[in-house]
């Protein structure tokens, strides 16, 4: 979390941003509030990014204000037009790209005064991980698969009963590169499983982290993800 | 309220060039894109191109060598032109407004203005 | 460039009857789906957008559903006066996209 304090000496407000990720090919949230104002006309929200000649987005006088927006971020952003007069001055943004990671600032102007933060925000893909039995193999084989990360991550197995234990030498993962030739389909199988015990396959990259898990028992096979951002800090 | 209105010639001779005008009212070509869209007789609609806030445009690339998209903020009107028109040029030309800055849908539409090419 | 497959073309459907109109795309794109309604000699009218928000003032027997590739709208109650034809557009990525429509005709 980062917060922010006014620039202009006693006439400060507080800005709160948090750091977030971006999945590339997806909508995105850059998050910021602010202490409200009671009439919409006296706020003015800016978003800028770092190294970025034009506005990400600017928002005045009750509505968007585009006229001096940068090239790379045209029909891509909106601000939630309703929640600005409640303090929330995030910016949605279109369709993520690998370029729009960077440092951003929100910089808000009411009638109390001024104050901005900065925001880090990092682009990548991550995608839940599906385990299953695989029946077509020689031995009880398990496969992960999820289908979209970038960077590339680390594939680790591990299990519950034997806890600690190594699996790399048992286990063979595989990247194979998706059509828009970025991001890449994660597939690792695992040899040598035994029954009765519960599977986790876990990937992570420096931006998330997820796991994949199945439960195979003589009667039922059971399956759970979860998958977290890393690095969400608020400013 | 928000309304968008085409003037065009209506008749184009072949190889000569087509020029319409939009006009807005309700809102300011400086919060949103006006985009371009044509519906040949009997056929679905064509997205041709659009024009942002900040001057920016982009075409579709069947037609970008022949397209030319620019405004005048301060009169509220947004000015469309293609060259080197042929028979199959002959449709509705709209111009439109997206719903949000983010492109999710045109909510507001011209009523259109019919161009035909013929000698 | 993104296809849109519209399908049926065209149906023909009793007052009171629930259909469904079908457009996929030829590759992902996310929810950036929009439904317009087009009466012969008017301009196209927006109706869903986002794949599933209803428009301002739409009547809600319209509804959108559908992310990535595959897309419905579903009339669930067909009135007379919806005699029209049906437009799915995608604005995801340049350049943006229609279907070529399915006309609804009323028995």
């Known amino acids: 979390l980062i917060i922010g304090f006014g620039i202009s000496g006693r006439h400060s407000i507080t800005v709160t941003t948090v750091a977030s990720a971006g999945n590339i090919g997806e909508d995105g949230i850059l998050s910021c509030t602010f202490e409200p104002d009671i009439k919409l006309s006296d706020i003015v929200i800016q978003w800028l990014k770092e190294g970025v000649i034009g506005l990400v987005h600017e928002f005045k006088e009750g509505k968007d204000e585009l006229s001096e927006q940068d090239e790379m971020f045209r029909g891509r952003t909106a601000v939630f037009a309703d929640q600005v007069i409640v303090g929330n001055a995030s910016l949605r943004l279109k369709n993520v790209q690998l370029t729009d990671a960077g440092t951003y600032k929100c910089y808000i102007i009411t009638s109390k005064g001024k104050g901005n933060a900065n925001l880090e925000y990092k682009t990548g893909a991550f995608s839940m991980p599906e385990v299953n039995v695989d029946y077509n193999a020689s031995s009880e084989t398990l496969r992960c698969e999820a289908p979209r990360w970038f960077p590339q991550p680390t594939v680790v197995w591990a299990s519950q009963v034997d806890q600690g234990a190594n699996f790399s030498e048992v286990s063979n993962t595989s990247f194979e590169l998706n059509s828009e030739n970025v991001t890449m389909k994660v597939v690792s199988v695992l040899y040598n499983v035994t029954i009765n015990n519960t599977y986790s396959c876990m990937i992570e990259n420096d931006i998330a982290k997820a796991t994949g898990d199945i439960k195979v028992t003589e009667s039922e096979i059971k399956r759970r993800s979860h998958l977290q951002l890393l690095n969400s800090k608020a400013s | 309220q928000i309304q968008l209105k085409e003037s065009g010639p209506g008749l184009v001779q072949p190889s000569q060039s087509l020029s319409i005008t939009c006009t807005v009212s309700?809102?300011?070509?400086?919060?949103?894109?006006v985009h371009w869209v044509r519906q040949s007789p009997g056929k679905g609609l064509e997205w041709l191109g659009v024009?942002?806030?900040?001057?920016?445009?982009d075409y579709n690339s069947a037609f970008i060598s022949r397209l030319s998209i620019s405004k005048d903020n301060s009169k509220s009107q947004v000015f469309f032109k293609m060259n080197s028109l042929q028979a199959d040029d002959t449709a509705i030309y709209y111009c439109?407004?997206?719903?949000?800055?983010?492109?999710?849908?045109?909510?507001?539409w011209g009523q259109g203005t019919l161009v035909t090419v013929s000698a | 460039i993104i296809v849109m497959t519209q399908s049926p073309k065209s149906m023909s459907m009793s007052v009171g009857e629930r259909i469904t109109l079908n457009c996929k795309a030829s590759?992902?794109?996310?929810?950036?789906v929009s439904w317009y309604q087009q009466k012969p000699e008017q301009s196209p009218k927006l109706l869903i957008y986002?794949?599933?928000n209803r428009y301002t003032g739409v009547p809600d027997h319209f509804t959108g559903s559908g992310s990535a590739t595959d897309f419905t709208l579903t009339i669930s109650s067909v009135q007379a006066e919806d005699l029209a034809d049906y437009h799915c557009?995608?604005?995801?990525?340049?350049?943006?996209?229609f279907g070529s429509g399915t006309k609804l005709e009323i028995k």
């Open positions: 439109a407004r997206d719903i949000t800055t983010i492109v999710e849908g045109f909510a507001y």
């Open positions: 309700g809102f300011s070509l400086t919060s949103y894109g």
């Open positions: 024009i942002w806030s900040g001057g920016y445009t």
């Open positions: 590759e992902n794109v996310g929810t950036y």
């Open positions: 986002g794949a599933s």
């Open positions: 557009g995608q604005t995801y990525s340049y350049p943006f996209t």
